[in-house]
């Protein structure tokens, strides 16, 4: 079996203020098992955007049903986009364990936001 | 951490229903399927069905399909399993397990229900 | 449906030695390039707990001990060394379908 890659296949992507941000991400094996999160920025200040197992973030929604067996698509759809919502958005694949322990990120997807059209 | 936290031993009446009770804490309860499996005293494991919490998707083993039924209680995080028309060979313990990777599998497991029947 | 058959029902081992449990399945078990096939330890009075996964990953925390091996339709526990607390019944299950175990395999100390 190939070892897990995680695919965020857009660069960049560009969102008008008020409008929903869909961010992609693939992973290409179900081995390991663990978690997916999301993450704005990267090292130890990152921000949680996302996390599979736990918490709860009224703002996102997972694109695909994640539960259904086989899926490996992990893109979110984040509502209301803010200025303050720019930044580069990692997504995360964790192995399970005690606690669950960062497995293999994705390259990055950078949301920038336009004005809202008047 | 996961938890799964089974309700107490049943004793019942043969004919009788019961309906045991799983209460998940350590995760986002409608993210992960909840599978039921029992054991008779000295045998093995025997799946009975499982339940997708996100959207009551079910699945039952042909055996049980007729008087099992699997629901969730997205407020309180817990899942329940009722077996009606109870017989003394539903005599075993009970077994609720969440399955973290969508792979049909059972990665944690709650401590078990024994369920007794017997006239 | 697909029937798990294991073999031996019961196995006694040295402390130190090699286990092999074996599970055959009634048709293959791979799709979509995964063998679904998964192994549990159960001791006595405790839930069953997962040791291996599509058919030769590692659960977390599991000693290096344990491996799983195989593909198809037959599929092989093997404890390395055995230790004193390695002593369980041990359960196959597969996930081709839905889930069906193995009648289990009862290990003991030689």
């Known amino acids: 079996e190939e070892e897990l890659q995680v695919i965020q296949p857009d660069k960049s992507v560009s969102v008008a203020a008020g409008e929903s941000a869909i961010l992609l991400c693939t992973v290409t094996s179900l081995i390991p098992v663990g978690p997916i999160q999301w993450f704005r920025g990267a090292g130890p200040a990152r921000e949680l955007i996302y996390n599979q197992k736990e918490g709860h973030f009224p703002r996102v929604t997972t694109v695909s049903e994640s539960t259904k067996r086989e899926n490996m698509d992990f893109s979110i759809s984040i509502s209301n986009i803010t200025p303050a919502d720019a930044g580069t958005y990692y997504c995360v694949k964790f192995r399970k364990g005690s606690p669950d322990t960062e497995f293999k990120s994705g390259a990055g997807t950078e949301l920038s936001v336009r004005a809202k059209p008047s | 951490q996961v938890q799964l936290v089974q309700s107490g031993a049943e004793v019942k009446k043969p004919g009788a229903s019961v309906k045991v009770s799983c209460k998940a804490s350590?995760?986002?309860?409608?993210?992960?399927?909840i599978n039921w499996v029992r054991q008779a005293p000295g045998q093995g494991l025997e799946w009975i069905a499982m339940?997708?919490?996100?959207?009551?998707?079910?699945h039952y083993n042909q055996i049980f399909k007729d008087r099992a039924t699997l629901t969730t209680d997205t407020s309180t995080s817990t899942a329940y399993m009722e077996l009606r028309s109870l017989r003394s060979d539903d005599t075993a313990v009970y077994y609720c397990?969440?399955?973290?990777?969508?792979?049909?599998?059972?990665?944690?497991w709650g401590r078990g229900t024994l369920v007794t029947v017997s006239s | 449906d697909i029937v798990l058959t294991q073999s031996p029902d019961s196995l006694a081992v040295s402390l130190g030695e090699r286990a092999t449990i074996n599970c055959r399945a009634s048709?293959?078990?791979?799709?979509?390039?995964?063998?679904?096939i998964f192994w549990y330890q159960q001791k006595p009075g405790q839930p069953p707990k997962l040791l291996i996964y599509?058919?030769?990953n590692r659960d977390s925390g599991v000693p290096d001990r344990f491996s799983g091996s195989g593909s198809g339709t037959d599929f092989t526990l093997t404890i390395s060394s055995l230790q004193a607390e390695d002593v369980a019944v041990y359960y196959c299950?597969?996930?081709?379908?839905?889930?069906?175990f193995g009648q289990g395999t009862k290990l003991e100390i030689k």
């Open positions: 048709q293959s078990v791979r799709s979509s390039g995964y063998n679904w």
């Open positions: 599509l058919a030769s």
């Open positions: 339940i997708d919490p996100s959207d009551s998707e079910t």
């Open positions: 299950q597969h996930s081709r379908e839905l889930p069906t």
């Open positions: 397990a969440m399955d973290y990777g969508s792979l049909y599998a059972m990665d944690y």
């Open positions: 350590g995760y986002t309860f409608t993210n992960y399927w």
